[in-house]
Each structure stands twice: as structure tokens, then as C-alpha cells.
Interface confidence: low
């Protein structure tokens, strides 16, 4: 069937269109094109005779049409009037006619649109804005874009006038955005430049910063005010209702108590005509004087004197605070505070009470500290210490002894030998000693301030022969897997070698055994029951040697898990039940029995004559070592059968 296809169907003004013929019959005489939907000689555009290849323009020919041998018609420089139907009349060789109609539409190329607005400065929550997309164009579709996105759905947004007008009701500051409109028709689409909506808003309630409302006398007051507003707000400050200045910041240097009061910031928007205010109350506190400490006794004597420290000056309705060693006061019966906390009394001072002490006065903003005060506590002398600790010396060596006693003020020292004053020095030196230098060496320490004296006596033996040593222990009854034991070989002697034996053998290598103090001390870590052996120490020098008597270590252990014997668990009725419980333990444990959870006797052996099936149940033996504080237990089930019913054993 003869058909006409318009390519394109929608044509832009000034462009061209081809009316393409499909299914053209064979054996044609010619054809003719007409404007409209029917053959009308008055509206003939062009005719074409195939035999002569002659094209003849008709009344509707515009000079823009070209006919092709295949009957297609090209129309150039399309104008709006060209819109409509076109009919092809085909005359076949047998003079039978055929017709086909096609059509196309002509649309203008759209100009770039622009946006007009009825209100360039709308006020938030009050005004509406109508944007209109210009120009008005027939057969065009209008679209809107906000921030390059399609229009959001909102009851405040309304499209009208064929979508050409976009109205924003009750604008808000959030409507400040980029708006574009777009015009579309079948042949073109054009987008406008952006229009930025400038919404006037505010001022919102201003905020005053910083937020703090308390200041000290002498500080600077610097307040800043801000309110969201378009255009930016104009600011005014009022103090206690009186206008101060028209600035965003209020600065008052070196404030006093008189600057306390209500501070108001007013924000004004000249375009919206609105004012908003915020009030803050500022309190300025007077600066208190720096406190200081007085003492009723600057040189107290340890364990004798009390000291009263007072925080000055006295101020009514003030909180006083105290610190010792940069920490708040410890709880102690020797520390007493007066009712107003202003006086701190130290009862019976000790050398540890030196301080430093600080007091503080608390005001509304902060705490003012005094300078620290240190007490000069007089103490001592303590018992003097004579070093070195050797008591045995060989003839011919030099004897050099030093004495020290804790004391404030420092002690004065004197040396006596066998009760006779030797010298008033802290050190005693005797060269090239002999057996005659053996004796009692006394150091006397004296505190001139307290008048107290203390002495220490040391026995010095000068001999070529070493004495028989002895073993001292720091723990005579250590607990297994818990305690350590340190054996020390006495005495301490100069230029002496110390040796150890265990059960007559030299020391085994063990990570639990450690020698220290020049081998004079043997430490056993985490003792076990196997460490309960005989320990001997020996001393030797170039001229003699000696061994101590043995010391046996008594290790407390257990109780281990007990064993109940005999092992039988099945008995015949009428037999005697004789159970014995044993647990390894040092010292021996205490035993107790429970049958079916019920306490029985506190013995090692449980005896029940002529048992019956009623004696069935659980038999528990409990062991307890009072020395180690440890307990243990074991449970055994006993079954008693009636005579002849079970192959059980009898006791």
C-alpha cells in the first residue's frame, strides 16, 4: 500500500523535511503533490511526468520544494505555514490513480528563557514570590529546577499558568536557592540563567557569647552578639536598660563590682523592620586578698609539741581550705580543724609532718592559695647505726667505723671503747689492730636542741681464728608453695668466704635457690615439703674455717587429698565397717567424718558395728591443717547388701 513517511515528523523552523514515499507502484505515468488532505488543483505544489522527466510547479509551489524521481518531496527552509497534510497523487500507465497522505508539524526554535520575579526581596514567613518564565511561547512545555534538581513536592510550591509561573508561598530562608526555568517543545529545549532568591529574614533571637556570667574584679569583659539575619543585623547594647553603643561587640576593660547587672543585646533588621533582644546577667565578684599562714610554734619537738597553723586574714562568711603535700587533708586523729576551718592543729607532731602546708580562701569563682609553709620538726636522735656490720676482724687490718643517727638538728657523736671516751667524731679509725683492740665499741648520738641522747654498742673481736658460725632464719615455719625462707650465716666477718651445704651435699642448682649478700644469705623461694632438710653454713679465710650446726627447715604443707582405706565399697549386712582416713600434712591434720552430709565424729577412724542396708550412702572424710589454713576432703559411696544377695566383700 502506498504510504508517506515524514522525516522528521516534528520540524524546526528553517530546517528541511523529506516526505518519503513507500510502496510506489510499478509502470507509472507520473505523480503530483498537493498541500492538504485531498487532490485540489488550486493547491498543487508540483507535478512530475516520468517519460519526459519534466517537473511542473503548481499554484502552491513556493520554490523551496524539490521532487525526486522516486516521488519523494524535499521541502527546504521550513516556515510555520508549512505545518499540515501533504497528498501524493500517483497516475499509473493504465491511468488508474492512487493517493496517499502524510503530514508534519513545524515548531519554532525556542529562545533562551529568562525568569521574572514579582518580589526581589521577599520577607520570610510573610511574603510570596511568583517566578514567571519568559517569554510566553505557544506549544511549549515549562519546567522548573531548584539547585539543579527537579522541583520538590511541597504545599508551599505551586505551579500555574501552564507551569509557566512558580509561586512560593510564605517564603523561608531555606528557599534561598538557585532557580532556573526551562522551555521545551518537540524540536528544542532551552534553560534560563539562574536566579538566586534573596529572602529577607530575622533577626532571630540573638546569642551572647561567651556564655559565662561570672567574672572577677579587674578582668576585661568582652561580649559578642550574633543573630541570624538577612541583611546582617545592626546591633545595640544596653546595660541595666541604658543604651551603651551600636556595635556587635561590647568591651569593658578592668571591670569592678559596679559593672554587675543585666546586659541586653538588641538586633535590628532594617529591611524586615524587626527587632529581637537577648538579656544576660553578669555578676562581678570582688578579688579577695591572698591568704598566708601563721604558726604558734616554728620549731616543734617530735612527739611532744602541738602546732596550730592559722590561715590569715580572717574574713567573715568565707570558706577556708587546707592542703598537705599538695593533697587535701588526710583523715587523722592528730589533725584537728577549728569550727570555721581557719585553724589547723597538729597534735603531737612527728618528723613526717614537715609539709608543705597551704591554705586557701574560696570565693565564687575560684580558690586563692597561700604560699607553702614547711614545719621545722625537731626529732631524734634515733638509735645510731654503726657500719660496717662486721664483728670479726683479723689482726693487722685497719678498723674504720662510722656512726649515723636520724636527728634534727643533726646529731653530735662520741665514741667510747669499753666505756672510755675516745673522740667526738662521727667516724672512728684505728690502724693496724691487734687482739688487744677487741672490746665493746659504743657510739653516742646527742641532739643539742632536744637534749636527748641515744647509744649503740657493738662487740668487735680481733682474732686470727674464725668463730663457729650459726644460721638465722626469717621464717621458722614456712608454708608450702606460698612462703620464701632466707637463711643468713652469722656473724658477718671481713675478708671471709661463705659456703652452704644441704643434707651434707653442696647446693643443688635450682631456680628456687638464690645466694646473695656475698653468699652469706641463702633464699629458698616457694618452699616445698622436699625442702625440709638439714642446712649447714661454713665460713673460711686464709688461716681458718668453721661450720655451723645444722638447721632443719620445718615446712608446713597439706593437707593433701585424703585416702580412705580399705578401698572396698560393697559390704554385706551384719559386717563391721571400719574406715580409716589418711592425708599427708605437716602438722598432722584434724579429721572429721560426714555420712550423707551429716557430721559424725572427729577421729581418723570411723567404726560402725553390724551394718545394715540403712548404712548405705556417701561417706566423706574432711581434713584440716590449722597451721596452713588449708582444707581437703574425699567422698566414698558405701553399698550394704542383705546377706546372701550380693557377692560383696565383708570387713
Amino acid at each position: 500500500k502506498l504510504t508517506i513517511e515524514s522525516t522528521p515528523f516534528n520540524v524546526a523552523e528553517g530546517k528541511e523535511v523529506l516526505l518519503l514515499v513507500h510502496n510506489l507502484p510499478q509502470h507509472l505515468f507520473g505523480y503530483s503533490w498537493y498541500k492538504g488532505e485531498r487532490v485540489d488543483g488550486n493547491r498543487q505544489i508540483i507535478g512530475y511526468v516520468i517519460g519526459t522527466q519534466q517537473a511542473t510547479p503548481g499554484p502552491a509551489y513556493s520554490g523551496r520544494e524539490i521532487i525526486y524521481p522516486n516521488a519523494s518531496l524535499l521541502i527546504q527552509n521550513i516556515i510555520q505555514n508549512d505545518t499540515g497534510f501533504y497528498t501524493l497523487h500517483v497516475i499509473k500507465s493504465d491511468l488508474v490513480n492512487e493517493e496517499a497522505t502524510g503530514q508534519f508539524r513545524v515548531y519554532p526554535e525556542l529562545p533562551k528563557p529568562s525568569i521574572s520575579s514579582n518580589n526581589s526581596k521577599p520577607v520570610e514567613d510573610k511574603d510570596a514570590v511568583a517566578f514567571t518564565c519568559e517569554p510566553e511561547t505557544q506549544d511549549a512545555t515549562y519546567l522548573w529546577w531548584v539547585n539543579n534538581q527537579s522541583l520538590p513536592v511541597s504545599p508551599r510550591l505551586q505551579l500555574s499558568n501552564g507551569n509557566r509561573t512558580l509561586t512560593l508561598f510564605n517564603v523561608t530562608r531555606n528557599d534561598t536557592a538557585s532557580y532556573k526555568c526551562e522551555t521545551q517543545n518537540p524540536v528544542s529545549a532551552r534553560r534560563s540563567d539562574s536566579v538566586i532568591l534573596n529572602v529577607l529574614y530575622g533577626p532571630d533571637a540573638p546569642t551572647i557569647s561567651p556564655l559565662n556570667t561570672s567574672y572577677r574584679s579587674g578582668e576585661n569583659l568582652n561580649l559578642s552578639c550574633h543573630a541570624a539575619s538577612n541583611p546582617p543585623a545592626q546591633y545595640s547594647w544596653f546595660v541595666n536598660g541604658t543604651f551603651q553603643q551600636s556595635t556587635q561587640e561590647l568591651f569593658i576593660p578592668n571591670i569592678t563590682v559596679n559593672n554587675s547587672g543585666s546586659y541586653t543585646c538588641q538586633a535590628h533588621n532594617s529591611d524586615t523592620g524587626l527587632n529581637r533582644t537577648t538579656v544576660t546577667t553578669i555578676t562581678v565578684y570582688a578579688e579577695p586578698p591572698k591568704p598566708f599562714i601563721t604558726s604558734n610554734n616554728s620549731n616543734p619537738v617530735e612527739d611532744e609539741d602541738a602546732v596550730a597553723l592559722t590561715c590569715e586574714p580572717e574574713i567573715q562568711n568565707t570558706t577556708y581550705l587546707w592542703w598537705v603535700n599538695n593533697q587535701s587533708l588526710p583523715v587523722s586523729p592528730r589533725l584537728q580543724l577549728s569550727n570555721d576551718n581557719r585553724t589547723l592543729t597538729l597534735l603531737s607532731v612527728t618528723r613526717n609532718d614537715v609539709g608543705p602546708y597551704e591554705c586557701g580562701i574560696q570565693n565564687e569563682l575560684s580558690v586563692d592559695h597561700s604560699d607553702p609553709v614547711i614545719l621545722n620538726v625537731l626529732y631524734g636522735p634515733d638509735d645510731p647505726t654503726i657500719s660496717p656490720s662486721y664483728t670479726y676482724y683479723r689482726p693487722g687490718v685497719n678498723l674504720s667505723l662510722s656512726c649515723h643517727a636520724a636527728s634534727n638538728p643533726p646529731a653530735q657523736y662520741s665514741w667510747l671503747i669499753d666505756g672510755n671516751i675516745q673522740q667526738h667524731t662521727q667516724e672512728l679509725f684505728i690502724s693496724n689492730i691487734t687482739e688487744k683492740n677487741s672490746g665493746l665499741y659504743t657510739c653516742q648520738a646527742n641532739n643539742s636542741a632536744s637534749g636527748h641522747s641515744r647509744t649503740t654498742v657493738k662487740t668487735i673481736t680481733v682474732s686470727a681464728e674464725l668463730p663457729k658460725p650459726s644460721i638465722s632464719s626469717n621464717n621458722s615455719k614456712p608454708v608450702e608453695d606460698k612462703d620464701a625462707v632466707a637463711f643468713t650465716c652469722e656473724p658477718e666477718a671481713q675478708n671471709t668466704t661463705y659456703l652452704w651445704w644441704v643434707n651434707g651435699q653442696s647446693l643443688p642448682v635450682s631456680p628456687r635457690l638464690q645466694l646473695s649478700n656475698g653468699n652469706r644469705t641463702l633464699t629458698l623461694f616457694n618452699v616445698t615439703r622436699n625442702d625440709a632438710r638439714a642446712y649447714v653454713c661454713g665460713i673460711q679465710n686464709s688461716v681458718s674455717a668453721n661450720r655451723s650446726d645444722p638447721v632443719t627447715l620445718d615446712v608446713l604443707y597439706g593437707p593433701d587429698t585424703p585416702i580412705i582405706s580399705p578401698p572396698d565399697s560393697s559390704y554385706l549386712s551384719g559386717a563391721n565397717l571400719n574406715l580409716s582416713c589418711h592425708s599427708a600434712s605437716n602438722p598432722s591434720p584434724q579429721y572429721s567424718w560426714r555420712i550423707n552430709g551429716i557430721p559424725q565424729q572427729h577421729t581418723q577412724v570411723l567404726f560402725i558395728a553390724k551394718i545394715t542396708p540403712n548404712n548405705n550412702g556417701t561417706y566423706a572424710c574432711f581434713v584440716s591443717n590449722l597451721a596452713t589454713g588449708r582444707n581437703n576432703s574425699i567422698v566414698k559411696s558405701i553399698t550394704v547388701s542383705a546377706s546372701g544377695t550380693s557377692p560383696g566383700l565383708s570387713a
Epitope: 519546567l143 539547585n147 534538581q149 527537579s150 520538590p152 513536592v153 511541597s154 536557592a177
Partner: antibody, heavy 121, light 107 residues
Framework: EVQLRQSGPELVRPGASMKISCKAS????????MTWVKQSHGKILEWIGL????????VYNQKFKGKATLTVDKSSSTAYMELLSLTSEDSAIYYC??????????????WGQGTLVTVSA | DIQMTQSPASLSASVGETVTITCGAS??????LNWYQRKQGKSPQVLIY???NLADGTSSRFSGSGSGRQYSLKINSLHPDDVATYYC?????????FGGGTKLEIK
């Protein structure tokens, strides 16, 4: 009552393409944008893109350009998402969601029940 | 793209307790943030839009707050029915990115 009814679960071969439908009822179809969201790995949600039924305009997440094609049929109030050249990475639940807005904040007020897509040989 | 970071990834709380979920954006999103709840096997539903506004049908036990880059969702007086995964979402600019989700369980 607003409803978004999605097409049923799909099992598709790798390399194939498929189309999910989302039929809207109970509101004016052209009044809201239609958004598509992918839920994978149990909980991760990814925004694929949106289409404005009023004029057919689309906005895609760059990650899904070439993977998803969004279309609408206004006459049947139905939105479609075509997924192209599927791989196992595309196995997920896909939701359509109708947008609402206040000022310039959009949110997804109405959601379809989800369509499970499994890509497997 | 704007990145949304949610924390914690999961949390467990007792009935009656108050819980808070936070969400950070990689840039200022000016309050353009929504919160969604997704229960097991169900579609997500909006709880809060525009950072602070309660969506229709959302219980008043839920509240949203925040501005700039930091936002939070607070659930008062926890109910067993609140067990779900919660998501925040940027809606300032496309792509409308979601947070990684917070799975809420009842102790």
C-alpha cells in the same frame, strides 16, 4: 492508602539483563519523584537514582550509571528499573521509594516491599 | 560524594533505657539529614526528616538533633519493638548517601 507494589523475586544468569516494576496507587503518581535503593550484604543501603514522573527527568548515582536505567509509564502509574549486564555483585534487594519534601529536604515516605534479585549461573 | 559515618555499628541495651546513635557527614549538610528504621525482613521506614522533624506515625520516644556535620538519633524508654537497623541519610545533594547502619538489640 499509598502503596508501592514491586514485581516478584528474580533468579537471573550472569551477563543477562532484567527489569523490575513498581506500581504506585493511592496518590498522584506525577506529584512525587521515585527513588530506587539497593540493599546488599545484609545491611548496606545505596541510593541508585531517581526519576521525576512528571517530565521523565532522571538523576543517577555515578556508580550505577550504565548499570541501571530508570523509566516510567504515566498511564499505568508504574516506575521501572532495568538492570544491565548482571554479575554476582548485583545480587541484592532493590526497593522503590516515593519521595516527599518540605522546603528543600527530601525524604522517602513510601517504600515498596522490595524485589530480591539473585544472579547465579 | 558526601560520606556518612554512623556509630556504633551495633549496640545492645535493656528495655526502658535511653540510647543514642550518632552520624557524621564529611562536610556541612545544613540539616538535610533523615533517619530510617529497617526491621528484619521489612522495608525501611522514615523516622526523622530534616534532622529534627518527626515523620508521620513516628513515636515521640524518637528524637533527632544536630547541625553542620554532626547529628544524632535518641530513643527514649527503649521498647522490644525498637529492635531494628537504623540508618542516617544525606539529602543535601545527590547521590543521597546512607550511613553504614546501626544494629540495635535488646539485652
Amino acid at each position: 492508602e499509598v502503596q508501592l507494589r514491586q514485581s516478584g523475586p528474580e533468579l537471573v544468569r550472569p551477563g543477562a539483563s532484567m527489569k523490575i516494576s513498581c506500581k504506585a496507587s493511592g496518590y498522584s503518581f506525577t506529584a512525587y519523584t521515585m527513588t530506587w535503593v539497593k540493599q546488599s550484604h545484609g545491611k548496606i543501603l545505596e541510593w541508585i537514582g531517581l526519576i521525576a514522573p512528571y517530565h521523565g527527568g532522571t538523576v543517577y548515582n555515578q556508580k550505577f550509571k550504565g548499570k541501571a536505567t530508570l523509566t516510567v509509564d504515566k498511564s499505568s502509574s508504574t516506575a521501572y528499573m532495568e538492570l544491565l549486564s548482571l554479575t554476582s555483585e548485583d545480587s541484592a534487594i532493590y526497593y522503590c521509594a516515593g519521595g516527599a519534601s518540605s522546603g528543600f529536604v527530601t525524604w522517602f515516605a513510601y517504600w515498596g516491599q522490595g524485589t530480591l534479585v539473585t544472579v547465579s549461573a | 560524594d558526601i560520606q556518612m559515618t554512623q556509630s556504633p555499628a551495633s549496640l545492645s541495651a535493656s528495655v526502658g533505657e535511653t540510647v543514642t546513635i550518632t552520624c557524621g557527614a564529611s562536610e556541612n549538610i545544613y540539616g538535610a539529614l533523615n533517619w530510617y528504621q529497617r526491621k528484619q525482613g521489612k522495608s525501611p521506614q522514615v523516622l526523622i526528616y530534616g534532622a529534627t522533624n518527626l515523620a508521620d506515625g513516628t513515636s515521640s520516644r524518637f528524637s533527632g538533633s544536630g547541625s553542620g556535620r554532626q547529628y544524632s538519633l535518641k530513643i527514649n524508654s527503649l521498647h522490644p519493638d525498637d529492635v531494628a537497623t537504623y540508618y542516617c541519610q544525606n539529602v543535601l545533594s545527590t547521590p543521597y548517601t546512607f550511613g553504614g547502619g546501626t544494629k540495635l538489640e535488646i539485652k
